[in-house]
Interface confidence: low
Amino acid sequence: DADMKGHFDPAKCRYALGMQDRTIPDSDISASSSWSDSTAARHSRLESSDGDGAWCPAGSVFPKEEEYLQVDLQRLHLVALVGTQGRHAGGLGKEFSRSYRLRYSRDGRRWMGWKDRWGQEVISGNEDPEGVVLKDLGPPMVARLVRFYPRADRVMSVCLRVELYGCLWRDGLLSYTAPVGQTMYLSEAVYLNDSTYDGHTVGGLQYGGLGQLADGVVGLDDFRKSQELRVWPGYDYVGWSNHSFSSGYVEMEFEFDRLRAFQAMQVHCNNMHTLGARLPGGVECRFRRGPAMAWEGEPMRHNLGGNLGDPRARAVSVPLGGRVARFLQCRFLFAGPWLLFSEISFISDVVNNSSPALGGTFPPAPWWPPGPPPTNFSSLELEPRGQQPVAKAEGSPTA
């Protein structure tokens, strides 16, 4: 079966998260500064005319770009889209931001700058005070807190109203740790790195973040091709060469927000064996309840069968037997020259009475190295509050 069971459709994770309809309370909207109480952070709701019609920072955003508007979503969400406006002021407002940057956090301490798939951080904003400009975030960000940093190319006043669009990230996957993806050299270079990973990279290991293995984009049968437009060969996959792993396996660790009973892990793999990509020969996972605790019990081992000669990409389901843990460490055994994964997701249930590491309160400082990014596709609440999702913008899958 090439499908990921419960795999969410990123195109449908586009619901307004509560600025305009006020389900995000004023107390969850803050800012670095405000020009006056009438342009305070609480006036930054899209299409609102409250106060003087927007949030306006006290200082100039040129040249330092240090002023920000912060929205606390209280729980982890996948934010797929943002919308901005300038200042309303009964139609008399002239202030808006032509461009801005985004920063986001999952724990309130570590902040990451959003970048598009090409590494560009600056987002085109508004051309006038009233028009709403929507920006598809490719890649989307898994965040609890989001900050908007308006920009200007000269000393001038800028003001913002905003909305965020996405859906609840219910899976609980906080991060994954994995070796850095490698480059395969065919007639052209095929870049199998995790190009949207938002954690740290040290000594050939990526840790503490989420990336392409949790972005909802399943790779094609031909790993050189991509679901995305205008990206490089191999973009959808993260891959490792057998030659680089004398152990014969790739080891990954996954960190979740709280104790969960894990039913299965699903790994979307490439099997274009004519070019060296093979499904893993087997998977071995072990479990523990806390970062400093011992691995519990015997590892779960699963040997892969099926039609290994079929070159189509597919989802491999690894049963996990209902084992309870917050951390998983899995080893993926090489069965050929290359392992190529495009997505990893988990089917799990929260263990009752387990205290969340994320939610109303922030988690303890992360243990090094933390685990994997949110990858559970079944973890997204697709239809909050009966809303309809915002339509996809014209053009590329990530606009």
Partner: antibody
Framework: SLEESGGDLVKPGASLTLTCTAS?????????MCWVRQAPGKGLEWIAC????????TDYASWAKGRFTISKTSSTTVTLQLTTLTAADTATYFC?????????????????WGQGTLVTISS | ELVMTQTASPVSAAVGGTVTINCQAS???????LSWYQQKPGQPPKLLIY???ILASGVPSRFSGSGSGTEYTLTISGVQCDDAATYYC????????????FGGGTVLVVK
């Protein structure tokens, strides 16, 4: 502003490097820098662009791949290397800046042009 | 490869009149990728319109652009002598498999 240099009269088969020097703006904020040529009395022909932000991604017209190479050589200069030149490459070569919206890898428009530099191929 | 085909040259217009120049793409493109340029002899091109319909800074409001899909139009209302030039459309889609492409150009003669 943009200023091209390096145009010359050269023989068929020769190579040439054209340079585009920018002033008044920074590549680091992320632009497309493009080369466009115009043969005498003819229309504009797009050659190649390079994205000048954090990563130097390039894009070429199919006919230019392999023979022409665009590079960012500093924070204010972009070059176009021309090889195996023929009489058909005789043209004024313009450097132009592409602004864009919606993130990199998308739409752009050429909002700033240099005056051009003339390349003549003749034996 | 994408081909952009423009109205055949020359196009004539009387001073004060209105003229339209068409640009047809060989396949459907997003309107955000289409821009228009004016070039006078001995000068580099000048940006007029981007994203099919947005007027570039400093360009007189008598110039306007419209279109979607494969058909795009540049309109000059109240044509002036100074508008005599060659006009080009451009599909600018960095990294697209179709390649970026200018139209062949349309010469405007003002009477």
């Amino acid at each position: 502003s943009l200023e091209e240099s390096g145009g010359d009269l050269v023989k068929p088969g020769a190579s040439l490097t054209l340079t585009c020097t920018a002033s008044g703006f920074s590549f680091s904020s992320g632009y497309y820098m493009c080369w466009v040529r115009q043969a005498p009395g003819k229309g504009l022909e797009w050659i190649a662009c390079i994205y000048t932000g954090r990563t130097d991604f390039t894009d070429y017209a199919s006919w230019a791949k392999g023979r022409f190479t665009i590079s960012k050589t500093s924070s204010t200069t972009v070059t176009l290397q021309l090889t195996t030149l023929t009489a058909a490459d005789t043209a004024t070569y313009f450097c132009a800046r592409g602004d864009y919206s919606g993130g990199v890898g998308g739409n752009y428009w050429l909002d700033l042009w240099g005056q051009g530099t003339l390349v003549t191929i003749s034996s | 490869e994408l081909v952009m085909t423009q109205t055949a040259s020359p196009v004539s217009a009387a001073v004060g009149g209105t003229v339209t120049i068409n640009c047809q793409a060989s396949q459907s493109i997003g309107s955000t990728y289409l821009s228009w340029y004016q070039q006078k002899p001995g000068q580099p091109p000048k940006l007029l319109i981007y994203k099919a319909s947005i007027l570039a800074s400093g360009v007189p409001s008598r110039f306007s652009g419209s279109g979607s899909g494969t058909e795009y139009t540049l309109t000059i209302s109240g044509v002036q002598c100074d508008d005599a030039a060659t006009y080009y459309c451009l599909y600018g889609g960095f990294g697209s498999s179709t390649g970026d492409a200018f139209g062949g150009g349309t010469v405007l003669v003002v009477k």
